[in-house]
């Protein structure tokens, strides 16, 4: 069928468009093109006979058409008034004609669009503002856009005047924003340049800054104000209702207790006309005198006194503070304080409650704290310690003992030798002894301040023959690559050297052994399983030697990945399934099997008697070590043939 | 189901011997170590001792050395305790119970309980 | 030997209370510890093991806790069938050690 189609359908001003033929049917003598839906001589445009590829202009005829061979027709420079349809006359040889009809439409090309608005300054919560998009142009859509966002949806937004106008009720400071409209029609779109709307506003109620409302006398007063408002605000205070300054800012230094009072800011608008004020009340105290601290006992007695702190001067309706090192109070029962809490009592005082302490008076606006006080707790004396730690000497050395205890005061010493009184010095010291020299040491602590006293006896060994030594250790039952063991030989002797064997050989050399301590102490680092042997220490001097009892490590390890036996994993059905499951483990592990997934007993042997395919599967055996903290598993996978189809074994 | 069956109750008197049976079933005898505990009348629970019934391996308290002898019966399911020398302080209710597993696991089931009167 | 010690020896406590023994062991018996429950006139019923494992059919209100030397039995909510004395084990080697017991009643 003859079919006419435009391209481009819709068609700029000034434009071409192709009225292109689709179908044309052969043996033609010519055909026309007529201006409207149907052939009109009136109206003929073009004609063409194909024979002599003569075109003919009709009465329609502009000048800007051209006629193809292929009877399609190019129309140039498009006009408004060519918008409508077009029909092709087709004559064919046997002179049976055709027709058909085709259109297209003229649009112009729209001019960049501009904005106008009915009231450039509107008051917020008071003006409507209508923006209306010029010019007014036929067939063309109108769009609005706010910020470059499309139009939100809001109840105070009202599009009219198809859409060429937007209204916004109501407006509010919110609304200030960049407006922008849009022309668009089949063949052309533009965008306005941008609108700021200029929305007046405020003032809100100003804000006084800073919020202190206390100040101490001799401060510098600076007040700032500070109102939401377009245009900006104009500012004026007022001091207890009477005019200050028409500034932003109030500044009055070196304040005394009479600027305390009512401080009023007033912002104003001066094209709303709107005033607003604020208020605060400034309250100038003057300045508190620096506190101290006195104290009814000032060498109060470790465990025995009670100490009362009191903060002074007393103030009425004042509030007290304390601190100790520099901290709040602990909560402890020893430390009580009194109901204004200007007296803090300490119960039965101890050497760790020296302090320094303060107290403090507090007023509207700061803490005033006292110089620290620290007590001197009499404390002591302690029982003594004697040194160095030996307590065997061979003859003919010096004994050189020196005692401390701890005390406040200082304590005074004093020395005995079997309870007979030797010299009141710290250090007791004896030239080249002998094995009378043997005996009990007795050091005796004294404090003056307090009265008490306190002993420490030693006994003392002047031999050539060394006592058996014993071994300690600092870890009885070591995890296997994680701990160490530190062994120590007893006792410290003076002048003795010391000796280790390990199952009955002399020490192996090895990274994860170490001697310190003058070869006292043997420490074993990662211990491991093969560790776990019999140690033996010696003690020897130029006249004598003696050896500890073994001492056997008990080292925890594993448990290892556990052995499933026997190893077989096909069975004739019938037999007996006898699985055992060992891991190497100390303590020995806990034993748990699993048959595909299922927990099933806790023992070490697995047994199922006259087993069947139904007892295929994985069998699992799962270890634990609580001492360890470690776990391992093993699964093993049991084939069950019926019996005679397997060459596997039979349990 | 697992089940442990006692004797029946014994009275003795001091310098005799008593021997208390426990029966197991519901389980395989071999598979789990069975120990025995007593509780003297009011008072709390005191091991014995246990013995492995596949084995014949025995561990006693040290309180009991010397006194006490386990053992068993594998084609009855059966253990024995013995108890000789006794005393009156030997007066209890004698449990025998079953390990929950091997090494390290508590006691999961137990007998009845036999009472033991040791009275001259 | 390893010493097991309960604390306390009795408690009384109403329906619905949380209740809870604590148990003390003389050396590190790590997890190794077990609890059992003893009604008048009857045999001793294992209710936890490895410190903190419930055995099965044990009611959920059972729970223990602890590792080292210090261990504790909870009740979360004592019920009338609670009425018992609770023994705590260590089952790390032998020989096997119980505590006292502690005796629970309701108020």
């Known amino acids: 069928k003859l079919t006419i189609e435009s391209t481009p359908f819709n068609v700029a001003e000034g434009k071409e468009v192709l009225l292109l033929v689709h179908n044309l049917p052969q043996h033609l003598f010519g055909y026309s093109w007529y201006k409207g839906e149907r052939v009109d001589g009136n109206r003929q445009i073009i004609g063409y006979v194909i024979g002599t590829q003569q075109a003919t202009p009709g009465p329609a005829y502009s000048g800007r058409e051209i006629i193809y061979p292929n009877a399609s027709l190019l129309i140039q420079n498009i006009i408004q008034n060519d918008t409508g349809f077009y029909t092709l006359h087709v004559i064919k040889s046997d002179l049976v004609n055709e027709e058909a009809t085709g259109q297209f439409r003229v649009y112009p090309e729209l001019p960049k669009p501009s904005i106008s608005s009915n009231n450039s300054k509107p008051v917020e919560d008071k003006d409507a503002v209508a923006f209306t998009c010029e010019p007014e142009t036929q067939d063309a859509t109108y769009l609005w856009w706010v910020n470059n966002q499309s139009l939100p949806v809001s109840p105070r937004l009202q599009l009219s005047n198809g859409n060429r106008t937007l209204t916004l009720f109501n407006v509010t400071r919110n609304d200030t924003a960049s407006y922008k409209c849009e022309t668009q029609n089949p063949v052309s779109a533009r965008r306005s340049d941008s609108v700021i709307l200029n929305v007046l506003y405020g003032p809100d109620a100003p804000t006084i800054s800073p919020l202190n409302t206390s100040y101490r006398s001799g401060e510098n007063l600076n007040l700032s104000c500070h109102a939401a408002s377009n245009p900006p605000a104009q500012y004026s205070w007022f001091v207890n209702g009477t005019f200050q300054q028409s500034t932003q800012e109030l500044f009055i230094p070196n304040i005394t207790v009479n600027n305390s009072g009512s401080y009023t800011c007033q912002a104003h608008n001066s094209d709303t006309g709107l005033n607003r004020t604020t208020v605060t009340t400034i309250t100038v105290y003057a300045e508190p005198p620096k506190p101290f601290i006195t104290s009814n006992n000032s060498n109060p007695v470790e465990d025995e006194d009670a100490v009362a702190l009191t903060c002074e001067p007393e103030i009425q309706n004042t509030t007290y503070l304390w601190w100790v090192n520099n901290q709040s109070l602990p909560v402890s029962p020893r430390l009580q304080l009194s109901n204004d809490n200007r007296t803090l009592t300490l119960l039965s005082v101890t050497r760790n409650d020296v302090g320094p302490y303060e107290c403090g008076i507090q007023n509207e606006l700061s803490v005033d704290h006292s110089d620290p006080v620290i007590l001197n707790v009499l404390y002591g004396p302690d029982d003594p310690t004697i040194s160095p730690s030996y307590t065997y000497y061979r003859p003919g050395v010096n004994l050189s003992l020196s005692c401390h205890a701890a005390s406040n005061p200082p304590a005074q010493y004093s020395w005995l030798i079997d309870g007979n009184i030797q010299q009141h010095t710290q250090e007791l010291f004896i030239s080249n002894i002998t094995e009378k020299n043997s005996g009990l040491y007795t050091c005796q602590a004294n404090n003056s301040a307090s009265g008490h006293s306190r002993t420490t006896v030693k006994t003392i060994t002047v031999s050539a023959e060394l006592p058996k030594p014993s071994i300690s250790s600092n870890n009885s039952k070591p995890v296997e690559d994680k701990d160490a063991v530190a062994f120590t030989c007893e006792p410290e002797a003076q002048n003795t050297t010391y000796l280790w064997w390990v199952n009955g050989q002399s020490l192996p050399v090895s990274p994860r052994l170490q001697l310190s301590n003058g070869n006292r102490t043997l420490t074993l680092f990662n211990v491991t399983r093969n560790d776990a042997r019999a140690y033996v220490c010696g003690i020897q001097n130029s006249v004598s030697a003696n050896r500890s009892d073994p001492v056997t490590l008990d080292v925890l390890y594993g448990p290892d990945t556990p052995i499933i036996s026997p190893p077989d994993s096909s069975y004739l059905s019938g037999a007996n399934l006898n699985l055992s499951c060992h891991s190497a483990s100390n303590p020995s592990p806990q034993y748990s099997w699993r048959i595909n997934g299922i927990p099933q007993q806790h023992t070490q042997v697995l047994f199922i008697a006259k087993i069947t395919p139904n007892n295929n599967g994985t069998y699992a055996c799962f270890v634990s070590n609580l001492a360890t903290g470690r776990n391992n598993s093993i699964v093993k996978s049991i084939t069950v043939s019926a019996s005679g189809t397997s060459p596997g074994l039979s349990a | 189901q697992v089940q442990l069956v006692q004797s029946g109750a014994e009275v003795k008197k001091p310098g005799a011997s008593v021997k208390v049976s426990c029966k197991a079933s519901?389980?395989?005898?071999?598979?789990?170590?069975l120990h025995w505990v007593r509780q003297a009348p009011g008072q709390g629970l005191e091991w014995i001792g246990y013995?492995?019934?596949?084995?014949?391996?025995?561990s006693y308290s040290q309180k009991f050395q010397g006194r006490v002898t386990m053992t068993r019966d594998t084609s009855t399911s059966t253990v024995y305790m013995e108890l000789s020398s006794l005393r009156s302080e030997d007066t209890a209710v004698y449990y025998c119970?079953?390990?929950?597993?091997?090494?390290?696991?508590?006691?999961?089931?137990w007998g009845q309980g036999t009472l033991v009167t040791v009275s001259s | 030997d390893i010493q097991m010690t309960q604390s306390p020896s009795s408690l009384s406590a109403s329906v619905g209370d949380r209740v809870t023994i604590t148990c003390r062991a003389s050396?590190?018996?790590?997890?190794?510890l077990a609890w059992y429950q003893q009604k008048p006139g009857k045999v001793p019923k294992l209710l936890i093991y490895?410190?903190?494992n419930l055995v099965e059919g044990v009611p959920s209100r059972f729970s223990g806790s602890g590792s080292g030397t210090d261990f504790t039995l909870t009740i979360s909510s004592l019920q009338p069938e609670d009425v018992a004395t609770y023994y705590c084990?260590?089952?790390?080697?032998?020989?096997?050690?119980f505590g006292q017991g502690t005796k629970v009643e309701i108020k």
């Open positions: 119970a079953r390990e929950y597993g091997n090494y390290n696991y508590p006691l999961d089931y």
């Open positions: 519901g389980y395989i005898f071999t598979s789990y170590w």
């Open positions: 013995i492995n019934p596949n084995t014949g391996y025995t």
């Open positions: 050396e590190n018996i790590y997890g190794y």
């Open positions: 490895n410190a903190k």
């Open positions: 084990q260590h089952h790390y080697g032998t020989p096997y050690t």
